[in-house]
Interface confidence: low
């Protein structure tokens, strides 16, 4: 029974620059107590874990990424906020277990934010919207 699919997720997820995206990964019964993670990088063995659950349903947030496990529904949800073009990459929904972890790839693509009227005007004034994002980004450094 080694070929049984233990975890599934969307093949691709699309987000808007400066927006947020949500990925839902579904796992089979029996994995409720295991740690779930979200990692970045096309190569499975070398991907960088961005955020990991604590074994409970408590949401864990790290920088712009959060993860929350719903053990009853057997889904864990990853949210990426304040998206940047550079966030486009191959990611993995994963479950930590003895031996080899279980994982499924998710391709994340980022579309440029629609150009607003204020952005096309000659005035380079920073609007509140821009300031909010800038403050959030500054907090990350």
């Amino acid at each position: 029974y080694s070929i049984v699919t233990q975890i599934t997720g969307p093949t691709t997820v699309n987000g808007l620059e400066r927006g947020s995206l949500t990925v839902q990964c579904v796992y089979r019964s029996g994995w409720e107590t295991y740690l779930k993670w979200w990692c970045r990088g096309a190569i499975w063995r070398d991907c960088k874990i961005l955020v990991k659950t604590s074994g409970s349903e408590q949401e864990v947030k790290r920088d712009r990424v959060s993860i929350k496990d719903n053990q009853k529904n057997r889904t864990f949800t990853v949210t990426m906020e304040d998206l940047m073009k550079t966030d486009a990459d191959t990611y993995w929904c994963g479950i930590e277990k003895t031996g080899n972890d279980l994982g499924v790839t998710v391709q994340v693509t980022i579309d440029p934010a629609p150009v607003t009227q204020e952005e096309t005007s000659s005035s380079p004034t920073l609007t509140g919207h821009h300031l909010d994002n800038r403050h959030k980004l500054l907090k990350l450094s």
């Epitope: 049984v4 409720e32 295991y34 074994g55």
Partner: antibody, heavy 122, light 111 residues
Amino acid sequence: EIQLQQSGAELVRPGTSVKVSCKASGYAFTNYLIEWVKQRPGQGLEWIGVINPGSGGSYYNEKFKGKTTLTADKSSSTAYMQLSSLAFDDSAVYFCARSESNYSYYYAMDYWGQGTSVIVSS
Amino acid sequence: DLVLTQSPASLAVSLGQRATISCRASESVDNYGISFMNWFQQKSGQPPKVLIYAASNRGSGVPARFSGSGSGTDFSLNIHPMEEDDTAMYFCQQTKEVPYTFGGGTKLEIK
């Protein structure tokens, strides 16, 4: 030899708590889950919940949430089930059982403890 | 919760004859092409012992006279030929979804 050795029978008063232990030997404790099952005299089996000694994560049957706390001590390869606010209908035999943690393969509870009898009496 | 209904509640079978125990689930316990159904035997004063897992696979050291079949919602455990040592309670269990649930049990005796 794989063994799950449970603590002895308990006679307890209503409203108190009791902690049942399940000591594992003969295998790598953190590589398998420990499940807990309740059996009232002459009755069927009820699944209480499961703990993953590797991660410390636990999952409870909704019916036993608040009544039961599952923990595991890696250093002594022992799993524990605490029952709180004991009532007469908590009187039962409680079993711990090992189940395969590598769910890439189908599993069932393959090794069981001998059971711990808990009697709630005033 | 997923409910498992076992029948009959008790059964008396002559030595050498066939015993058949049924288990019906309130919804399908199949997933990924596998039936998540187990069968346990419990003798008096002892813990349960797994006989069959994934509907039809015998557990380690389980004699060939025990066999399981079925898929979806209907499952059965067959014991043939019946031996004296088979006097026990038998339970089905589903592990398709939590909380895992057991059938009410079937008491098997010698006729």
